[in-house]
Interface confidence: low
């Protein structure tokens, strides 16, 4: 008995071939011997089966001795043994129809779980293997679960159902709702304008929700809400903003915040959360601000950084075009009695400069000693 696998909602074509390459009488029946369709001369006739309005054949093939049964908009309950009677012969075809669906919305938040459920006909024992867009294979029986979805899981999941050594393939598009970056760090000199951007890793027709940026300044004992906002059809409107600092927010996506001045008291870490309408859970993006200040006070040239710097970062003070005078894995370095010239304060990681601030040291004129 030939086995054919079909997909719920699809169309399947069951073949039936006569040895004579001409149009002869044929009938398709189900396992209960109920006629589905056949021919009467060059006309298609239909029987009283439940498939009536979904069954068809290809009359253009009859002259070649081919009498297919076409079933449209397949249902799981169409799974059956179909019998083609032609030339006093019976050809049996077992049709097994499967369906694969995501048990929830196909738009899921990063970190959530995806469950795929297989609908299968009674008596079948299929196995399912799914391959995620990043190439991860998962397998199971009637259900497959993937916990902790990641951004790379966005895209087309290819699932193969195996039954009787036959395969049928399903493709399910999954959108993982997340920010493009989980974390970012901005390095700024004191006084510079700071731009924070929070691009989303997905696009949807309508995007509605609300968000907030909480900020933990390095110098502060507790975090505070810097700004809250609403998102309606991709339009951003500010609900509440602190007076210090007074952030500005762009009116369109991507979410964009401007801090007028980078100051040591603002250096620290923030967490932008975005709650989307009709979704449980929130999207998160961490943002870090490192601020540098170079100052000269009397005979002391000092360079300091504030904010979340790694212990492997190097802070250096050097006179332009000369070797570094001081270079330490510290958040503050200084030079006593610096010579005149343009000094550079550098924050670097493995030789790559992350932040640079220049300060000019003027010559000090000593009073001539009287003879």
């Amino acid at each position: 008995k030939k086995v054919v696998l079909g997909k719920k909602g699809d169309t399947v074509e069951l073949t039936c071939t006569a040895s004579q390459k001409k149009s002869i009488q044929f009938h398709w029946k189900n396992s209960n011997q109920i006629k589905i369709l056949g021919n009467q001369g060059s006309f298609l006739t239909k029987g009283p089966s439940k498939l009536n309005d979904r069954a068809d054949s290809r009359r253009s093939l009859w002259d070649q001795g081919n009498f297919p049964l076409i079933i449209k908009n397949l249902k799981i309950e169409d799974s059956d043994t179909y019998i083609c009677e032609v030339e006093d012969q019976k050809e049996e075809v077992q049709l097994l129809v499967f369906g694969l669906t995501a048990n929830s919305d196909t738009h899921l938040l990063q970190g959530q779980s995806l469950t795929l459920t297989l609908e299968s006909p009674p008596g079948s024992s299929p196995s399912v293997q799914c391959r995620s867009p990043r190439g991860k294979n998962i397998q199971g029986g009637k259900t497959l679960s993937v916990s902790q979805l990641e951004l790379q899981d966005s895209g087309t999941w290819t699932c193969t159902v195996l039954q009787n050594q036959k395969k049928v393939e399903f493709k399910i598009d999954i959108v993982v709702l997340a920010f493009q970056k989980a974390s970012s760090i901005v390095y700024k000199k004191e006084g510079e304008q700071v731009e924070f951007s929070f691009p989303l890793a997905f696009t949807v027709e309508k995007l509605t929700g609300s968000g907030e940026l909480w900020w933990q300044a390095e110098r502060a004992s507790s975090s505070k809400s810097w700004i809250t906002f609403d998102l309606k059809n991709k339009e951003v409107s500010v609900k509440r903003v602190t007076q210090d600092p007074k952030l500005q927010m762009g009116k369109k996506l991507p979410l964009h915040l401007t801090l007028p001045q980078a100051l040591p008291q603002y250096a620290g870490s923030g967490n932008l959360t975005l709650a989307l309408e009709a979704k449980t859970g929130k999207l998160h993006q961490e943002v870090n601000l490192v601020v540098m200040r170079a100052t000269q006070l009397q005979k002391n040239l000092t360079c300091e950084v504030w904010g979340p710097t790694s212990p492997k970062l190097m802070l250096s003070l050097k006179l332009e075009n000369k070797e570094a005078k001081v270079s330490k894995r510290e958040k503050a370095v200084w030079v006593l009695n610096p010579e005149a010239g343009m000094w550079q304060c550098l924050l670097s990681d493995s030789g790559q400069v992350l932040l640079e601030s220049n300060i000019k040291v003027l010559p000090t004129w000593s009073t001539p000693v009287q003879p």
Partner: antibody, heavy 118, light 113 residues
Framework: QVQLVQSGAEVKKPGASVKVSCKAS????????ISWVRQAPGQGLEWMGW????????GYAQKFQGRVTMTRDTSTSTVYMELSSLRSEDTAVYYC???????????WGQGTTVTVSS | DIVMTQSPDSLAVSLGERATINCKSS????????????LAWYQQKPGQPPKLLIY???TRASGVPDRFSGSGSGTDFTLTISSLQAEDVAVYYC?????????FGQGTKVEIK
């Protein structure tokens, strides 16, 4: 039945880069990942990495991290594999293969011979 | 990475006789939840790309003659050519695809005695 057609043989000097193309025809380009496998003269098969032409996602073997880059052009149904900082031991036949849903390779390109010689 | 070791390195068999190639993996490639062995066998003739013969350790790929069969489970696998034909002269490779990176055996050369 999908077919994979690769670009022609290349001769390169040590330190140079090579970019091999793999064009899919006769099937849906984005349905399967494409893996790259190389074979040095008289040697066995070595997996280099894969790319999902649909999403652009890639995964590289640790040995080739930093030297290999896989890209795709969906408009021409072509996947590219670029290997940089070539050395003599990179002399090999480079194959692209359709990475089946399970991870076996039912369809292979004809292979591209890359010779690295000073 | 999983290491695949084939034996023997080469094999000479008379036409019509049985040829057996073994493949051992450094760790199991059997998925217990799926009850499938993630192992494939390939045939490679000179100047040609490899050709998939067997997947899931024992399932013949489309168009592969039934004289080729695969068996084994866990870490030990066998490719059998029940009656060697002249066109079967080639190098045969096993490959695991249970984990990334997928890895191949070193190959077994089959010749006619």
């Amino acid at each position: 039945q999908v077919q994979l057609v690769q670009s022609g043989a290349e001769v390169k000097k040590p330190g140079a880069s090579v970019k091999v193309s793999c064009k899919a025809s006769g099937g849906t380009f984005s349905n399967y990942a494409i893996s790259w496998v190389r074979q040095a003269p008289g040697q066995g098969l070595e997996w280099m990495g894969w790319m999902n032409p649909n999403s652009g996602n890639t995964g590289y073997a640790q040995k080739f991290q930093g030297r290999v880059t896989m890209t795709r052009d969906t408009s021409t149904s072509t996947v590219y594999m670029e290997l940089s900082s070539l050395r003599s031991e990179d002399t090999a036949v480079y194959y692209c293969a359709r990475d089946d849903d399970y991870g076996d390779y039912p369809v292979w390109g004809q292979g591209t011979t890359v010779t690295v010689s000073s | 990475d999983i290491v695949m070791t084939q034996s023997p390195d080469s094999l000479a068999v008379s036409l019509g006789e049985r040829a057996t190639i073994n493949c051992k993996s450094s760790q199991s490639v059997l998925s217990t939840s799926y009850n499938k062995n993630y192992l494939a066998w390939y045939q490679q003739k000179p100047g040609q790309p490899p050709k998939l013969l067997i997947y899931w350790a024992s399932t013949r790929a489309s168009g592969v003659p039934d004289r080729f069969s695969g068996s084994g489970s866990g870490t030990d696998f066998t490719l059998t050519i029940s009656s060697l034909q002249a066109e079967d002269v080639a190098v045969y490779y096993c490959q695991q695809y249970y984990t990334t990176p997928p890895t191949f055996g070193q190959g077994t050369k089959v010749e006619i005695k």
